[in-house]
């Protein structure tokens, strides 16, 4: 949700941050393999090119950029966004009739655009919905036992534990780990009330749970979300993960063959969203002013008055639904089995104009423009372009993750980049981006080529933009591509410093969006131009536009972080020598590959393919091979989560300095060894064949 993102400000419209979507999971019934799916075509068969292809093709970048721009100029984005916000498709909860009807519309549009092939994946997944009979409820229990009803909320939090709890109520600001640590009172055995924003609902609940809270209430405060409607309902989900939480780490194919299982990311406490009006009613019974540093409106109070309790009843129920992911492909002319994936969430709990309408509209228009460029304008992409419309994004990128889980063993050898279109337009002031470092150079080139829709200046305004880029967050559909599958991914947005206030609410309508962004068509055009240029650069050039050298600086900064603890490391009788060596090997491998590329005969597609194959493996090899994708799905040592990550290793060392008795030395020794070998593995993969690897290790 919008309120889960926190972005840096970048003056002049160029910069970083993260705009994105949810997570994912998948149940598939089509047994075809990905290559089989892509094999068929509904357009005339294209001749297989010979060993060499004309070098002249590299000169077409300016032509293609201009052609894309011309098509963008004549495209009506707002008309499509408005269409997707009509009652025929609104609301479109995942797996519902309206979601399916929109899926069919997308599928028919892809066919009309004459894409090479259009297909669908069907999955059966479990989501959580409100009970049709029993109501969720928040009540104040007076000392004499009288009940004072606060609210039966219209919104809810999917994957809450369905249960009833009573206890004291305390405020925990945004519910970040830092917020909980800084509280002057204990939350142990109490319910906590937190405001939306800064981090995902799932992280708020996990943090509350780790501090032994018994339940969580989430509301939108007036300062962060200056919405007039105090009774506005809010929706979100609390799964600390992506995909179907009841088939963790594996796809939801025919679910009967799998043992019952559930994600460790599911909360063990109830969580419920409440309106601001309900929160203010609770504050009326609470005491203690909230700290000024919270920058919160004055109605905020800290603790429920003595002799009173709050009762939270959550009656959400599990529901098995059928979801459809819709795909269309434009086949590459040289390497059709390598593809860039462009995707957008289709479903929404409410009207979902900014949440899924804009992304779906961009997806449709990009598919139309690129198909047009291929069929009419002579664009011959070397690699394939897959357009994907995901369902159940609102429940944690379920559709997207299910697809990834279904093809885990092979997808990283085929899909080399994911471009996320979700929430690409939330404002106008800033251009923010979150991505794998492999894509930073491509992003920079694109920012130097695309003008801000309002200021008319190029998006590239800050040469230091890359240092301010934020990690992809769990609620972004690009996250599982990067952290689970090891596929470089990018998510971007035109947005404000403040959160878009209507995401996850019934006010996320076209009407509100166009009111807040009168230049909506121009901004959507710019978002499409950014994504379009990414696609051209990634599919047109002979060399894959993935800058493997960018991880050198990431590894270097990790080494710098570790160097602060060299005394601690020496005290344990350990050395960083092997880690330095692995980092050095990675550096040398990147230098060698760059030299290989410069010396290569660019027109020899076999040589180029060998080089590109090495580049494609880089991200995947940053997935720790030492943890199970089922237990720790987000295996990426930089961007994932869990004890195998480089940040966890550093946190563990910090703990040694802060509280040596809590420090786990055995865990650290493992972390250091496995991180070293993972980095060494990436260096080896980049070096190519085994006889090229200098193994003096």
């Amino acid at each position: 949700h919008h309120h889960h993102h926190h972005h840096h400000h970048h003056s002049g419209g160029g910069g970083s941050g993260g705009g994105g979507s949810g997570g994912g999971g998948s149940k598939g019934v089509e047994p075809k393999t990905e290559s089989e799916r892509l094999a068929g075509t509904e357009s005339p068969v294209r001749e297989e090119p010979g060993e060499d292809f004309p070098a002249a093709r590299r000169l077409y970048w300016d032509d293609l950029k201009r052609k894309l721009s011309e098509k963008l100029d004549s495209t009506d984005f707002t008309g499509t966004i408005k269409l997707l916000n009509e009652n025929s498709y609104v609301p479109r909860e995942a797996g519902s009739q309206k979601d399916e009807n929109l899926a069919l519309y997308v599928e028919n549009q892809f066919r009309e655009f004459k894409l090479s092939k259009v297909w669908r994946d069907q999955h059966f997944v479990k989501i959580q919905v409100k009970d049709s009979i029993g109501q969720n409820m928040v009540t104040i229990v007076q000392s004499n036992g009288n009940l004072d009803p606060v609210e039966s909320p219209e919104g809810y939090v999917a994957f809450s534990k369905p249960t009833e709890v009573s206890g004291k109520l305390v405020h925990a600001n945004f519910g970040t780990k830092k917020d909980f640590e800084e509280l002057s009172y204990s939350v142990n055995g109490s319910l906590v009330i937190v405001r939306a924003g800064e981090i995902t609902f799932a992280e708020k609940v996990a943090n509350a749970q780790s501090f032994n809270a018994i339940g969580v209430l989430i509301y939108m405060d007036k300062n962060k979300f200056p919405v007039v409607e105090a009774d506005l309902a809010l929706f979100g989900h609390a799964h600390l993960g992506t995909g179907d939480p009841y088939t963790p780490g594996f796809p939801s194919f025919n679910h009967t063959q799998f043992p019952p299982s559930q994600s460790s990311g599911l909360p063990n406490i109830p969580v419920q969203t409440i309106s601001r009006a309900a929160a203010e009613k609770l504050f009326g019974k609470m005491e203690g002013s909230c700290p000024a540093r919270w920058n919160i409106d004055s109605s905020c109070k800290l603790e429920l008055s003595q002799n009173q309790n709050v009762k939270l009843i959550v009656k959400n129920v599990l529901k098995e639904i059928k979801i459809l992911n819709i795909f269309g492909v434009i086949k590459g002319f040289v390497e059709p089995d390598h593809y860039v994936v462009v995707g957008a969430q289709r479903d929404a709990w409410g009207p979902g104009a900014a949440k899924s309408g804009v992304g779906t509209a961009l997806l449709l228009k990009l598919a139309q423009m690129f198909s047009d460029m291929v069929l009419k304008d002579g664009f011959q992409p070397s690699r394939s372009i897959i357009f994907a419309s995901w369902s159940a994004g609102d429940f944690g990128s379920v559709g997207a993750t299910e697809w990834l889980e279904g093809y885990l063993s092979s997808l990283h050898l085929k899909a080399f980049t994911y471009i996320n279109l979700d929430k690409a337009v939330l404002g106008t002031s800033n251009f923010k981006v979150s991505a794998s470092p492999l894509l930073y150079t491509l992003i920079e080139k694109t920012m130097q080529n695309v003008k801000h829709p309002v200021t008319g200046q190029f998006l590239y305004q800050d040469s230091n933009w890359a240092s301010k880029v934020e990690k992809l967050t769990l609620d972004n559909a690009a996250f599982p591509f990067l952290a689970y599958s090891g596929i470089p991914a990018v998510s971007f947005c035109f947005c404000e410093d403040t959160d878009y206030p209507y995401l996850g609410t019934t006010m996320d309508t076209y009407k509100e969006l166009i009111e807040r962004i009168p230049e909506l068509n121009k901004v959507a055009r710019a978002a499409a131009e950014v994504a379009g240029q990414f696609v051209i650069k990634l599919t047109h050039d002979v060399e894959l536009n993935l800058d493997y050298e960018m991880y050198n600086s990431k590894l270097l900064s990790f080494m710098k972080d570790l160097n602060q603890f060299k005394t601690d490391i020496r005290d344990m009788g350990l050395s960083l020598q092997w880690l330095y060596s692995a980092r050095g090997d990675y550096f040398r491998a990147t230098s060698r590959l760059t030299t290989d590329f410069h010396n290569a005969e660019k027109t020899n597609r076999f040589v180029m393919r060998e080089i590109n194959d090495r580049i494609m493996k880089v991200e995947y090899h940053f997935l720790s091979p030492y943890v199970s994708p089922r237990e720790s799905p987000f295996r990426h040592i930089f961007w994932g989560s869990g004890s195998h990550t480089l940040s966890a290793l550093v946190e563990n060392l910090k703990l040694r300095q802060k509280n040596i008795t809590a420090f786990n030395e055995t865990l650290f020794r493992n972390q250091l060894a496995l991180a070293t070998w993972t980095i060494q593995g990436v260096a080896n993969a980049l070096s190519g064949d085994i006889w090229n690897i200098d193994n003096e290790f």
């Epitope: 009652n87 025929s88 609301p91 479109r92 909860e93 519902s96 009739q97 009807n101 309508t509």
Partner: antibody, heavy 123, light 113 residues
Amino acid sequence: EVQLQQFGVELVKPGASVKISCKASGYIFTDYNMDWVKQSHGKSLEWIGDINPDYDTTSYNEKFKGKATLTVDKSSSTAYMELRSLTSEDTAVYYCARGGYSGSSYYHPMDYWGQGTSVTVSS
Amino acid sequence: DIVMSQSPSSLAVSVGEKITMSCKSSQSLLYSTNQKNYLAWYQQKPGQSPELLIYWASTRESGVPDRFTGSGSGTDFTLTISNVRAEDLAVYYCQQYFIYPRTFGGGTKLEIK
């Protein structure tokens, strides 16, 4: 008891506009969509469009886009349909009807109907 | 748009008789996920507004006498009135609510001999 109250007759000149009202009672107005249906004399029924009073979103039959505009006033639980650039073809009885639950992702029939407003376009 | 065709356009029956009228849609109204047919029948008595009789092709609206029965699936639907009474004099419309725009049949006018 669910009731949709419409006013009987509107006599308007060609080229003019008319705004028909439909006041709902007996249920929570924002909980259900409101549909509008046209019936020309002796003819069948034609669906014009619907409005979701909770989200303030609409859908129109392509045939009536540019002709009809649907709005609501939540405070008075009233739905409105404005018809513009009227011609003799627009002479008909116009009904409002309660549609499906506004928060539903599924389609539903129209379960309660107003008594209709007769619009006559004549110079 | 889905085209709804009703037949006959009119029929005259005597009180106490059983009659059936047909409604055909140009595409299936069956939603496979919930196995429901998105078809409704409305009754419009002279000078009155339409009233919902049947929805989901066969479910009677509350208060509707069990003389009225809806049946059919996919593209072919039937409304049966057994033991016709004088107050059943009306035009009966079928309507699909499976896909926007919602569309109605031309109606079947029931006259009493």
